[in-house]
């Protein structure tokens, strides 16, 4: 997949920033707001920001610029630079009228079918589990294989470096074709197939990627919010995987929720399957020692472990993956349509 160019974004923060730089008033306001970072702590949902008057004034000046509605894309070049601008500008949107975070990612339209050739799988035993089959599909694709080997190397060995492992995981889930990445991670296993479940749980190399001692979930979020990329991915996840009702309706769409979920892998907030026997997922953190923020911590933890939107989205994708290999599929080669952007 070619990386999205700025021009394909409706209003890229990089473009908007360049426009702003050409306007002395906007440029000065942006710089001032950027320097306000130290005086405005990033508030957690339970806190109200305290804002100096000059920062409010700079924010007010930026509210009329094209920066206000600017967005980024997960696969764009200079993504981190774009996100840095987004979060600086986000303060202008929210100062004095604190709004909960809004995802910085724009959903771009993709309609090109992605082809999978299943005929090459005949080298596998017919009764091989689906996680093995999806792993083989990745191996048979040059790009997927190369990216998977890169994180496999970085995340293996007794002395693996966690930050290097995470960076390679992030790269894999960002650059591998979405159906490959989703197939690898969200492969269905028979309820009694522990080997398959273990293979699935080990997809992200949890021994290296996840912290050896579970930190407090709120501390983990604080750490995540200090990094524009992690913060963006978490906010994107909370936007698209918010459950609307107990049926598991997602606030936007299941496909967007899954994309956002996979986008967290390789960040400080990397989730994973909790066992080999079911499809429950969770963050690798604890709410012990949260004091009077216990409820807030449990809500964050529950957004992963007790989220009917996420649970249903994962289940639906696994059902889809099962159907790909069912006997009644008409051709060994078929196209998987990428999801259209929609309202």
């Amino acid at each position: 997949d070619p990386l999205p160019t700025e021009s394909r974004l409706m209003n890229s923060c990089l473009q908007a920033r360049r426009k702003c730089q050409a306007d002395p008033t906007c440029s000065a306001a942006y710089h001032h707001l950027d320097s306000c970072t130290s005086s405005i702590s990033t508030p957690l949902p339970s806190e109200e920001p305290s804002v100096p008057a000059d920062c409010l004034e700079a924010a007010q000046q930026l509210r009329n610029s094209s920066l206000i509605g600017c967005m980024c894309h997960r696969r764009m070049k200079n993504q981190v630079a774009c996100l840095d601008i987004y979060w600086t500008v986000h303060r202008a949107r929210s100062l004095g009228n604190y709004e909960l975070d809004v995802s910085p990612y724009e959903d771009t339209v993709t309609s090109k079918p992605w082809k999978m050739n299943l005929s090459k799988l005949n080298m596998l035993k017919p009764d091989s589990d689906l996680c093995l089959k999806f792993a083989m599909l990745c191996t048979l694709n040059d790009k997927c294989d190369r990216l998977r080997k890169a994180y496999g190397e970085a995340c293996s060995g007794p002395h693996c470096q966690r930050h290097v492992c995470l960076r390679q995981l992030l790269t894999f889930f960002e650059k591998a074709a979405e159906p490959h990445a989703q197939g690898l991670l969200l492969c269905p296993c028979a309820p009694n197939d522990r080997g398959c479940g273990e293979r699935r749980r080990n997809t992200i190399a949890p021994n290296c990627a996840l912290p050896p001692v579970a930190p407090n979930c709120l501390e983990l979020r604080r750490l995540c919010f200090s990094d524009p990329l992690c913060r963006s991915r978490l906010v994107d996840f909370q936007t698209h995987c918010h459950p609307m009702d107990i049926l598991g309706t997602c606030a936007t769409e299941q496909s967007r929720c899954l994309r956002a979920y996979l986008g967290l892998i390789g960040t400080a907030m990397t989730p994973n399957f909790v066992s080999n026997v079911n499809t429950s997922v969770a963050l690798s953190c604890t709410c012990r020692g949260s004091g009077n923020l216990q409820e807030e911590c449990e809500m964050l933890e529950g957004f992963f472990s007790h989220n009917p939107c996420l649970t249903e989205a994962i289940a639906a994708k696994m059902r889809f993956h099962s159907q790909l290999f069912s006997q009644d599929w008409p051709h060994p080669t078929f196209a998987v349509m990428a999801h259209q952007n929609e309202n």
Epitope: P243, T249, A251, T252, E342, N343
Partner: antibody, heavy 115, light 108 residues
Framework: QVQLVESGGGLVQPGGSLRLSCAAS????????MHWVRQAPGKGLEWVSV????????YYADSVKGRFTISRDNSKNTLYLQMNSLRAEDTAVYYC????????WGQGTLVTVSS | DIVLTQSPATLSLSPGERATLSCRAS???????LAWYQQKPGQAPRLLIY???NRATGVPARFSGSGSGTDFTLTISSLEPEDFATYYC?????????FGQGTKVEIK
């Protein structure tokens, strides 16, 4: 554009039946849970029924349980509400709705139950 | 069934004033599944807030929601002329889903 359009409302006698339809366009209908909500003249909103995106789960308000049936045809992008044994208190404007972050409501269709 | 009671029934305020609407549940509601709607005469409702505190697409920042358990609040920080309408809370935490009876915000 993204919209929901209800039809099938009208005047019916108590004990009669009516089938409401809601045609969806501009979005992938099969990806969404859908609701029916009604509003009696001059009164508040009353939730009626919900159906999961694939039609496998349906739920109803106590006041319509056993009389109304919600269904959907994803190939036709259409939501239905079959209303049997209608009563005077079922008189209302019926809305179909997609209740997500970017919600969509139909314009409503009036059902009048009167002899 | 979960009964939602909104108060006050009517709120008479002037443009620019702050409006605070309350929604009380007969039993605890998971805040993920609490929503607020605005409805103007002759129009369909419009989702304002979902998950107790998240603004729906296109909803102005002057609308905010808060609360947990059995007590939820919708706040309009500074009323604009177009905000005079009826507001409903709804829970989607237990079947049947239910609405509150509504709070009418009228011009004083």
């Amino acid at each position: 554009q993204v919209q929901l359009v209800e039809s099938g409302g009208g005047l019916v006698q108590p004990g009669g039946s009516l089938r409401l339809s809601c045609a969806a366009s501009g979005f992938t209908f099969s990806n969404y849970t859908m609701h029916w909500v009604r509003q009696a003249p001059g009164k508040g909103l009353e939730w009626v029924s919900v159906i999961s995106y694939d039609g496998s789960s349906t739920y109803y308000a106590d006041s319509v349980k056993g009389r109304f049936t919600i269904s959907r045809d994803n190939s036709k992008n259409t939501l239905y509400l079959q209303m049997n044994s209608l009563r005077a208190e079922d008189t209302a404007v019926y809305y179909c709705a997609r209740i997500v972050r970017m919600d969509i409501w139909g314009q409503g269709t009036l059902v009048t139950v009167s002899s | 069934d979960i009964v939602l009671t909104q108060s006050p029934a009517t709120l008479s305020l002037s443009p620019g004033e702050r409006a605070t609407l309350s929604c009380r549940a007969s039993q605890s509601v998971n805040s993920h599944y609490l929503a607020w709607y605005q409805q103007k005469p002759g129009q369909a409702p419009r989702l304002l807030i979902y998950g107790a505190s998240n603004r729906a697409t296109g909803v102005p920042a002057r609308f905010s929601g808060s609360g947990s358990g059995t007590d939820f609040t919708l706040t309009i920080s500074s009323l604009e002329p177009e905000d005079f309408a009826t507001y409903y809370c709804q829970q989607m935490d237990g079947f049947p889903f239910t609405f509150g009876q509504g709070t009418k915000v009228e011009i004083k």
